[in-house]
């Protein structure tokens, strides 16, 4: 089948990379600079994506994919393969169409992207509030408060975090 | 592919009111402020306004305040302009397009524009 | 409103030559968050507008880079290295800092 296909259309033999030069007799043309063909048999180069402006090149464009892009320090990639380029805000803000706003009360965002999101309920768990969240930090729960209740063993909290390669004191 | 579609020409009578559809693909116009922008013949540009369709929340500039009224429906991706009591100072074509200050696409888009004439 | 000035208003170039269109606003287009929300359009004869540049220098895709865009506060520049033929048209600066939004009155570039 193969065969008889590629009897029948010459251009099925031209692999990606190529295009089918209809101008020269069907023989296969390497793609032209800043084009390439991801698929064997096609008639056409397809033109490489630039990344200019807030854009930047993750990959280059070669004969047989294309360029990929992503965003500058400042902008983080949106949509399908890096449609759009979105301003980083703070932590503790989100991006709103008047641009970046601090989180209301109640919620917070720990990433320089997204939305601000609800602090967790701990009551919803059964638990209690252990740490205050803020507008970069979620709450930190605790055990139930009958946990705490006298008798009870108390909670050691986590021991505060070293810098690597730093012994304690 | 993300593509704008205005509704087409009109002819009205001085007086008259109007309203223009600006309809989006690829995108959801509530994710946008979509703005509207007036081209007299041979004229320059003129900013009329933005509308966000999530809220309904608009900003006019002074000289449109009471001329321009911007609506949008995102149940249809269509943001509208409604022109009142026109002129031939409306006679134009009316653009839309979703600016924004702190998204950028890799392509920048414009509606096809839909030309107005005030005529008796 | 910021007022946007354009000159000049006509720039008649050779397919080639450079050519160079000054924007200045009333008031700087310097915003709070420290970005300048300057941008230049391109309306080629019988077309919609087109972006080419956003804040100030930053190239649209498909924008070749002939095209350069300058300048902070309330001077601002668009340079094209060497004109071509498919340049022609009026380009205009548009200001997205303040309300209203403002564009320039537009500088028309023809060929020689």
């Known amino acids: 089948f193969e065969r008889t296909r590629s009897l029948q259309d010459p251009c099925s033999n031209c692999p990606a990379g190529t295009f089918c030069d209809n101008n020269r007799n069907q023989i296969c043309s390497p793609c032209p600079p800043n084009s390439f063909s991801s698929a064997g048999g096609q008639r056409t180069c397809d033109i490489c994506r630039q990344c200019k402006g807030v854009f930047r090149t993750r990959k280059e464009c070669s004969s047989t994919s294309n360029a990929e892009c992503d965003c500058t320090p400042g902008f983080h990639c949106l949509g399908a393969g890096c449609s759009m380029c979105e301003q980083d805000c703070k932590q503790g803000q989100e991006l709103t169409k008047k641009g970046c706003k601090d989180c209301c009360f109640g919620t917070f965002n720990d990433q320089k992207r997204g939305i601000c999101r609800p602090w967790t309920n701990c009551s919803l768990d059964g638990k209690s509030v252990l740490v205050n969240g803020t507008k970069e930090r979620d709450v930190v729960c605790g055990p139930s408060p009958a946990d705490l209740s006298p008798g009870a063993s108390s909670v050691t909290p986590p021991a505060p975090a070293r810098e690597p390669g730093h012994s304690p004191q | 592919e993300v593509q704008l579609q205005q509704s087409g020409a009109e002819l009205v009578r001085p007086g008259a009111s109007v309203k223009l559809s600006c309809t989006a693909s690829g995108f959801n116009i509530k994710d946008y402020y979509m703005h509207w922008v007036k081209q007299r013949p041979e004229q320059g540009l003129e900013w009329i306004g933005r509308i966000d369709p999530e809220d309904g929340d608009t900003e006019y500039a002074p000289k449109f305040q009471g001329k321009a009224t911007m609506t949008a429906d995102t149940s249809s991706n269509t943001a509208y302009l409604q022109l009142s009591t026109l002129t031939s100072e409306d006679t134009a074509v009316y653009y839309c397009t979703p600016y924004s200050n702190y998204v950028y696409w890799y392509f920048d888009v414009w509606g096809t524009g839909t030309t107005v004439t005030v005529s008796s | 409103d910021v007022v946007m000035t354009q000159t000049p208003l006509t720039l008649s170039v050779t397919i080639g030559q450079a050519a160079s269109i000054s924007c200045k606003s009333s008031q700087s287009l310097l915003d709070s968050d420290g970005k300048t929300y300057l941008n230049w359009l391109l309306q080629r004869p019988g077309q919609s507008p087109k972006r080419l540049i956003y804040l100030v220098s930053k190239l649209d895709s498909g924008v070749p880079d002939r095209f350069t865009g300058s300048g902070s506060g309330t001077d601002f520049t668009l340079k094209i290295s060497r004109v071509e033929a498919e340049d022609l048209g009026v380009y205009y600066c548009?200001?997205?800092?303040?309300?209203?939004?403002?564009f320039g009155g537009g500088t028309k570039l023809e060929i020689k």
């Open positions: 548009w200001q997205g800092t303040h309300f209203p939004h403002t």
